[in-house]
């Protein structure tokens, strides 16, 4: 029998340029008579144009929704009802070609053509894009709050905030023809639920979404987004009701930046420069294509690319890369944003050099990509360390911490977290190395203690980049480095003269002079530690709630012992900057560290002094007795303590802790156990210091109270942010 043909709705969106009309401000106001009259005429013209072609039989509906410069640009959508089997044949490209062909056929015609009655349409200015019914619905929902803006060259235009009576608004942005638009979004409130979406076209077409941001993102307080050309749309969706705009938008046209470089690298190891996408740190634009050619001076070297929070992965089944496509020596890789560092190592086999291409394969983009490049020795990529093949990084080997995700850095170790004697490969305790007493059979632990040695896991790196064999030589009163740098920045880690309460849980004034109390509206929220004249360190999770993210809320107290009273030694500060570790992940507690910059420098006293920061190579031995301090709850679920409490704890091997916590313990974490499990850090101690006393009598910061199961529960450990795992970031910020 007869079977009715299935028809489907195909939606197209686009724009056309009218050469004999000029844009006027009236056309930006939908309620104006000029807008109503122009849309009526433009709509009629559009319908006539479509029905003049063989698409006419499929015509369903159309709408002109906006105008722009150029001399006059009309923005529209239309729907065709197409037999299902012809759907693929009428792609946006085919439809555009049919309409252009129609326009061209009538350019020099003297015959009366209905769609040319009023408008001279430029065939070269016609653009047709694929859209959907959902896109049209999204567009229609914004039409009550539709803003068109043209930005001239050299201009920076601040956009008018949304209409808070509307639930959704659209800013339609246009710039000069051969430039690209750069949109800057700055969140101005600590907390909101607003959503903003940026598109690479005039309307909210899902397939041309550049990016969407949501809810006053603290991770990205400022976002800069590049369009591929001179047109862009921004759609706002209301979150919580607010009388204040939670964001500021501004836009400017910028010139296309070439992204092609030819470089010859020097004959030296380590980072030699930076490659980045145009206008970094702006989001890269939807049609970015970068090509970098690097020439390596010798086949002894390989090329290393060090990424920050971005990794390269093999993509299965030729799927498009959603976060940037890379081709390196004909290998296709996809970018992936991660909260970890990553390095790609490229072995060099020919002197011709290496070409690296970066392309944005889809319209959806992301934060600009920056990569440090440099050379590594192909025969020894990580001198004194282990090359982690999973992430391309050099990590300490055999130090008792599985730095490499596959744990291979801790496999096949003769001496793990100990010193290997040359004579017979026996393993001795690290503190016994270079202590003036031979412990190895022939005294190899006491050799080369006064000279530079190759850098390794436990060697200390001096400022001149040479290394010394003695473990933990910092601030011990004896210069071990030729340049004396192991004894610099040593005005730290000394307790004030205090009437120590031996064995007591309550601390006395000056006993822990680096201890900080971080307060909001007079309430102690977290602990912290003074590490420099203007910097206090704490845990990032203290600022997890959006309501806690603003610096203005916080007051930092130093020299404090009692919460309910003040004494002459205590001082308070406001916070001028709050920096969370860029890799901090709330769910896993990884990189749980934050730095607070105080509004003025501290004046050191017996009650206020910084704690010493360990070098990356500092080794805190399992079994070492250390101390945690804080005003945290004295029991699980209890109120905070009035007096500063101190608890001695014992450092625990990483693998044991990892087993107990089902392998959720990362290399940036450190564990400590308590006698009988009754001594523990508890709620309110978060961010507070875990300090260990060196033989010199100075206290070093080993950890920050981070997480754990309850408070002092038997068979569980307290988990701390491992300072040696985040020290490079701390030093980068503080210095």
């Amino acid at each position: 029998g007869y079977k009715a043909e299935v028809m489907v709705s195909q939606v197209y969106s686009g724009s056309l340029r009218v050469l004999n009309r000029h844009f006027s401000q009236d056309l930006t106001r939908r309620e104006s008579s000029a807008f109503r009259s122009e849309t009526a005429k433009a709509q009629k013209m559009l319908k006539e144009l479509i029905t003049s072609t063989r698409l006419g039989t499929y015509y369903n509906s159309s709408s002109v929704y906006s105008f722009g410069e150029g001399p006059l640009t009309c923005f529209f959508w239309f729907i065709l009802q197409i037999p299902e089997h012809r759907r693929l044949m009428l792609s946006p490209e085919v439809v555009q070609a049919l309409l252009v062909e129609e326009l061209l056929s009538t350019v020099n015609s003297s015959a009366a053509v209905p769609y040319r009655a009023e408008y001279e349409v430029d065939p070269e200015g016609l653009v047709i894009l694929e859209a959907s019914v959902k896109d049209i619905a999204a567009l229609n929902s914004t039409l009550g709050c539709y803003r068109y803006s043209y930005v001239g060259q050299g201009q920076v235009l601040r956009l008018k905030g949304p209409d808070h009576l509307a639930s959704s608004c659209l800013w339609h942005l246009q710039g000069p023809k051969d430039l690209m638009l750069k949109l800057r979004l700055e969140w101005t409130l600590a907390e909101c639920r607003d959503r903003l979406a940026m598109y690479d076209v005039a309307g909210p077409l899902e397939k041309r979404l550049i990016t969407s941001v949501y809810g006053c993102s603290r991770q990205e307080p400022v976002v800069e987004v590049l369009a591929s050309g001179a047109i862009m749309a921004v759609v706002w969706k209301k979150g919580l009701h607010s009388y204040y705009d939670p964001f500021v938008l501004s836009v400017q046209p910028v010139v296309f930046q070439a992204c092609e470089v030819n470089l010859t690298l020097d004959n030296r190891l380590d980072s030699q420069g930076v490659l980045s996408t145009p206008y970094f740190p702006s989001y890269y634009s939807p049609q970015t294509h970068c090509s970098w050619h690097l020439t390596v001076p010798s086949l002894d070297y390989g090329l290393a690319l060090w990424f920050d929070a971005y990794a390269l992965r093999r993509q299965k089944y030729d799927l498009p890369c959603t976060q940037g496509q890379w081709t390196i020596q004909n290998r296709r890789l996809c970018g992936l944003r991660i909260l970890q560092p990553y390095a790609e190592r490229i072995p060099v086999v020919a002197t011709a050099g290496i070409t690296i291409n970066f392309t944005s394969q889809i319209s959806l983009t992301g934060p600009g990509v920056r990569v440090h490049y440099g050379l590594y020795n192909q025969s020894d990529p990580c001198p004194g360390e282990f090359l982690c093949s999973v992430n391309g990084l050099c990590v300490p080997a055999c130090d008792g911490v599985k730095d490499c995700p596959n744990g291979l850095d801790e496999r096949n170790c003769v001496c793990r977290a100990t010193f290997q004697c040359k004579e017979d490969s026996t393993c001795i305790s690290l503190p016994k190395v270079c202590d003036g007493q031979p412990d190895c059979l022939n005294g190899s632990d006491e050799e080369q203690c006064q000279e530079g040695v190759p850098c390794g896991t436990f060697t200390f790196q001096c400022e001149d980049r040479s290394c010394v064999k003695k473990p933990n030589p910092q601030c011990d009163g004896r210069p071990d480095c030729r340049d004396g740098s192991d004894e610099e920045h040593c005005d730290c880690g000394l307790q004030g003269p205090s009437s120590r309460i031996v064995g007591g849980a309550v601390s006395s004034e000056g006993e822990w002079p680096w201890q900080a109390s971080l307060q909001v509206r007079g309430r102690h929220i977290c602990g912290g530690a003074l590490i420099a004249d203007r910097w206090v360190i704490t845990a990032a999770h203290c600022f997890q709630e959006d309501s806690m993210a603003s610096t203005v809320l916080w007051t930092v107290f130093l020299g404090k012992v009692w919460q309910n009273s003040r004494w002459p030694g205590e001082v308070s500060f406001k916070v001028s900057r709050l920096l969370l570790h860029p890799y901090h992940e709330e769910d896993s507690h990884d990189y749980d560290v934050a730095l607070l910059q105080l509004d003025h420098p501290v004046v050191r006293s017996a009650a206020v002094r910084p704690v010493c920061l360990p070098a990356r190579s500092h080794f805190f031995e399992p079994g070492l007795h250390c101390w945690i301090t804080g005003w945290g709850a004295l029991r699980e679920g209890g109120p905070i303590s009035n007096a500063l409490q101190k608890v001695d704890v014992q450092l625990i091997p990483q693998d044991l802790c990892s087993e107990v916590y089902r392998y959720q313990v990362t290399p940036r974490m450190l564990c400590a156990g308590y006698r009988k499990g009754k001594k523990d850090a508890c709620q309110g101690d978060s961010g507070g210091p875990l300090v260990c006393k060196a033989l010199s009598g100075r206290w070093f910061l080993a950890g920050l109270v981070s997480w754990g199961l309850g408070c002092g529960r038997p068979n569980y450990f307290g988990v701390y942010t491992r300072i040696t795992g985040v020290i490079s970031w701390i030093q980068q910020v503080v210095t």
Epitope: G400, R416, A417, T418, I428, S429, K432, E621, P622, G623, Q650, I652, P653, Q654, D655, L656, E659, V660, G673, Y674, R675, K676, G677, K678, P714, N715, F717
Partner: antibody, heavy 120, light 107 residues
Framework: EVQLQQSGAELVKPGASVKLSCTAS????????IHWVKERTEQGLEWFGR????????EYAPKFQGKATLTADTSSNTAYLQLSSLTSEDTAVYYC?????????????WGQGTTLTVSS | DIVMTQSHKFMSTSVGDRVSITCKAS??????VAWYQQKPGQSPKLLIY???TRHTGVPDRFTSTGSGTDYALTISSVQAEDLALYYC?????????FGGGTKLEIK
């Protein structure tokens, strides 16, 4: 000075029960775990179990589960090991020891030991 | 359970000699190893914990080495009073287990 004083030697018949005691001086048992270690001539030292005198919570080595009950009386600073359904396999010296840490347990102080002989 | 193996049941030495008693764990115990000395008719005494840390009052002729699964207790110059039974113990994971013991005898 830290000391652990154990009760005297016991000679008991198979199937009977016995309760050994361990009185601490120089420290408060509430602040530590008290462990029991069994020593037999051929087997060497075997960890038997431990008690937290503060709340009575105890843990036993799997092979001794059901054989013993650990208790403590904090007022007298004393810990007890009760052994039931005795057999010749239970003939041994039993030491009470002090465990210094939560999970990483080594035994810093030991009692003098109680010799238990199970014989008909 | 973690098995601790002391391969030598007996070791002969002379006063003044250096001697090493070895102990092997069935798995990596991350330096969570203690050593005890037991003299005839006495209870064991703690010598070393965390593989390297001497307990209060232990003479410095007693030292220890090791990592991973292999550990050793060394007496740098044996004294007559050191003749005893020596046990290793892992304090890494419950149930806490001891080695079978090594008896140090005079030649």
């Amino acid at each position: 000075e830290v000391q652990l004083q154990q009760s005297g030697a016991e000679l008991v018949k198979p199937g009977a029960s016995v309760k050994l005691s361990c009185t601490a001086s120089g420290f408060n048992i509430k602040d530590y775990y008290i462990h029991w270690v069994k020593e037999r001539t051929e087997q060497g030292l075997e960890w038997f179990g431990r008690i937290d005198p503060e709340d009575g919570e105890s843990e036993y080595a799997p092979k001794f589960q059901g054989k013993a009950t650990l208790t403590a009386d904090t007022s007298s600073n004393t810990a007890y090991l009760q052994l039931s359904s005795l057999t010749s396999e239970d003939t041994a010296v039993y030491y009470c020891t002090r465990g210094d840490s939560m999970m990483v347990t080594y035994f810093d102080y030991w009692g003098q030991g109680t010799t238990l002989t199970v014989s008909s | 359970d973690i098995v601790m193996t002391q391969s030598h049941k007996f070791m002969s030495t002379s006063v003044g000699d250096r001697v090493s008693i070895t102990c092997k764990a069935s798995q990596d115990v991350s330096t969570a190893v203690a050593w005890y000395q037991q003299k005839p008719g006495q209870s064991p005494k703690l010598l070393i914990y965390w593989a390297f840390t001497r307990h209060t009052g232990v003479p410095d002729r007693f030292t220890s080495t090791g990592s991973g699964t292999d550990y050793a207790l060394t007496i740098s110059s044996v004294q007559a009073e050191d003749l005893a039974l020596y046990y290793c113990q892992q304090h890494y994971r419950s149930p806490w287990t001891f080695g079978g013991g090594t008896k140090l005898e005079i030649k």
